[in-house]
Interface confidence: low
């Protein structure tokens, strides 16, 4: 069919140079060189329908979906996958050839599946159709670790079932709060599966292999404490196993401690007890609350009581999925050029997150902190003050968020200007978005102050560079104009900028910048 | 099901050249995202390079960059890694490897379905 647009379905996958992932130099670290997709008509279909050839694609990687379209004058389109459409916004290469493209970051379980691309051009009609699988044969994994008790002795053997077979390590530390941050001289490492000496502050167990580090703690309350303003929660996934260890320090062995779920007693067998002496004689005990594996009724207050300390509770939520709750409603902000700022996303989640910040395709190191109430913050500082879109996409396994965020820095617009045989352009992409003059400088007018009426079209904002909004004004020339200079001007609310073009006939044209 | 038989592997001296070929049984093989793996005596076994299905994407690790390259023919159901100024610490049996059941295979780790059975490559003066 003569009619027939030539396309191109190719497929750019973008190099996971993500530090915080933790990915180890002897994996394949893809080129972004395109692979093409090889677009062959769809026989006997209904209309003009292209299929790619599918793409299997890893947890986590990155990839871009583009069709370049050989085909005269503009095209419009609209992407549709799980039978919601998403937004598309065509532009043109250097071939002329439109380009449309769908990026799907950090690939998950969820956006696996077909995504349509309808494509309707002066001359015909036509769909697209992508499949995009999840590679579901790993060769590596690595899993969170879990506890259980040894059998006929008091300690805790950790467990990570991961591959290759992980490193185990337990992370003791005796202090409280900040100064059991990793790498602090109170921190204590010991790297071995099984742990008796189960009296410590705070105890985590962490696994590590070529896929990076995960790490769980042990849930503890802890009698001497002063309670949290906020109850403490433990969220865990049906067939998890629980863990709750309950602390008291008194000054003789002459206490007890017990656990009770929603006022009653646990099950004989759900929980066992140790006692030490410490270095100054006063009696620690510790009461462990356990479960080999949760269902939804192990849900609830977990409270634990002494006879000589007020008692305290934590609520215990078995979930059939994991979760990540935060507001995902993208948030614009304006700042000055040396104004410090941070984004911060606020999130509650289970299993813990993975997380990236993105700006310019270029991923970023994610750190979280636990925050008081059962909430994680995730903060980014390191924007250089450069304006654009900003992206937290966060992953656990079993849930997927991302929210976006604008940066707008407030600047007085820097021109730039081109022009060819018929036309002159300059863009700028100052903040707020500047307005346009063009003047045209002659012997009636030396200082450049005689306007040009006609001619002129503007666009505000018509390319969007990683979120940065450029905003651009032409100027169409006409034959009696070339051999002329004219200025054009760009102003906002924090000052004007000019250049001055030279319109010549097609060739090398001079810039001179205007002061 | 694809069968995969390596070949080319000996003796060379450091700083010497050598080609391995991998052959593979079946009509899919172009259908296969392709690589070589290697094992060193007492060591696990570890990445060296990969091609895509259309043999236009080429990843390799890093202690190779540079010195070796791989390269597919469809038509002939071979894959190649040809090897330049070789190392002591390149000795390794080589084993070809095909991953991912569909034409296009991005992935950030090596996901193996099918292993060949392998050949000496000794690097020594």
């Known amino acids: 069919n003569q009619d027939l647009p030539v396309i191109k379905c190719v497929l750019i996958n973008h190099k996971n140079n993500d530090s915080s992932v933790g990915k180890s130099s002897s994996y394949p670290m893809v080129s972004e060189s395109p692979e093409d997709l090889g677009c062959a008509l769809r026989p006997q279909s209904a209309g003009t329908v292209y299929e790619a050839a599918t793409v299997e694609v890893d947890v986590s990687a990155s990839i871009t979906l583009q069709v370049l379209v050989d085909t005269p004058g503009n095209i419009s389109c609209l992407w549709v996958f799980k039978h919601s459409s998403l937004n598309c916004q065509p532009h043109f290469d250097v071939q002329n050839r439109g380009v449309v493209s769908m990026v799907i970051l950090k690939m998950t379980e969820t956006q696996a599946g077909e995504y349509l691309l309808f494509i309707q051009s002066e001359a015909t009609n036509y769909t697209i159709v992508f499949t995009v699988s999840i590679r579901n044969t790993l060769l590596f994994t690595l899993r969170r670790p879990y506890f259980r008790k040894m059998e006929n002795q008091d300690a805790l053997v950790c467990i990570s079932e991961s591959v290759p077979e992980p490193i185990v390590e337990w992370v003791l530390c005796d202090s409280q709060g900040e100064s059991c941050k990793e790498e602090s001289p109170a921190v204590v490492k010991k790297e071995e599966k099984v742990l008796h000496e189960l009296f410590g502050t705070d105890i985590r167990c962490c696994a590590r292999n070529e896929l990076g580090r995960e790490c769980t703690r042990l849930f503890t309350i802890d009698l001497n404490q002063t309670p949290q303003t906020t109850l403490p929660q433990l969220f865990l996934k049906v067939g998890e196993p629980l863990w709750i260890r309950c602390k008291a320090v008194h000054v003789n062995h002459g206490f007890g401690l017990t656990w009770e779920l929603e006022n009653k007693a646990l099950e004989e067998g759900s929980y066992f007890e140790m006692s030490t002496y410490s270095t100054n004689r006063t009696m620690i005990r510790i009461l462990f609350a356990f479960v080999s594996s949760v269902a939804r009724n192990d849900t609830g207050y977990y409270t634990c009581s002494s006879s000589k300390h007020p008692s305290q509770s934590a609520l215990v939520t078995i979930v059939e999925k994991g979760f990540i709750n935060a507001t995902n409603s993208s948030e614009d902000y304006e700042i000055d050029q040396y104004e410090e700022f941070c984004f911060s996303v606020r999130f509650k989640a289970y299993p813990q997150i993975r997380c990236t910040w993105t700006f310019s395709r270029k991923a970023f190191p994610c750190e979280q902190k636990a925050l008081d109430d059962g909430y994680s913050v995730s903060k980014f500082c390191n924007h250089k003050h450069q304006p654009g879109e900003y992206i937290f996409h966060a992953e656990n396994g079993d849930a997927q968020f991302t929210k976006m965020f604008t940066l707008n820095i407030r600047r007085k617009p820097q021109v730039l200007a081109e022009a060819s045989a018929s036309q002159a352009s300059c863009s700028s992409d100052g903040y707020p978005l500047p307005s346009w003059t063009w003047k045209k400088c002659s012997d009636k007018s030396p200082n450049c102050t005689e306007d040009i009426p006609e001619g002129v079209w503007n666009r505000k904002a018509n390319r969007k560079v990683f979120g940065q909004w450029v905003s651009s004004s032409t100027l169409n020339m006409s034959e009696a104009m070339k051999g002329f200079l004219v200025k054009c001007c760009a102003y906002n609310s924090l000052g004007t900028s000019c250049e001055t073009i030279l319109l010549n006939s097609p060739g090398p044209f001079p810039f001179i910048q205007d002061s | 099901e694809v069968q995969l038989l390596e070949s080319g592997g000996g003796l060379v001296q450091p700083g010497g050249s050598l080609t391995l070929s991998c052959a593979a049984s079946g009509r899919t093989f172009s259908s296969y995202a392709m690589g070589w793996f290697r094992q060193a005596p007492g060591k696990e076994r570890e990445f060296v390079a990969a091609i895509s299905w259309s043999g236009s994407s080429t990843y390799y690790a890093d202690s190779v960059k540079g010195r070796f390259t791989i390269s597919r023919d469809n038509s002939k159901n071979t894959l190649y890694l040809q090897m330049n100024s070789l190392r002591a610490e390149d000795t390794a049996v080589y084993y070809c490897?095909?991953?991912?059941?569909?034409?296009?295979?991005?992935?950030?780790?090596?996901?193996?379905?099918?292993w060949g059975q392998g050949t000496l490559v000794t690097v020594s003066s």
């Open positions: 490897a095909a991953g991912g059941s569909t034409r296009v295979v991005v992935t950030t780790t090596p996901v193996v379905k099918y």
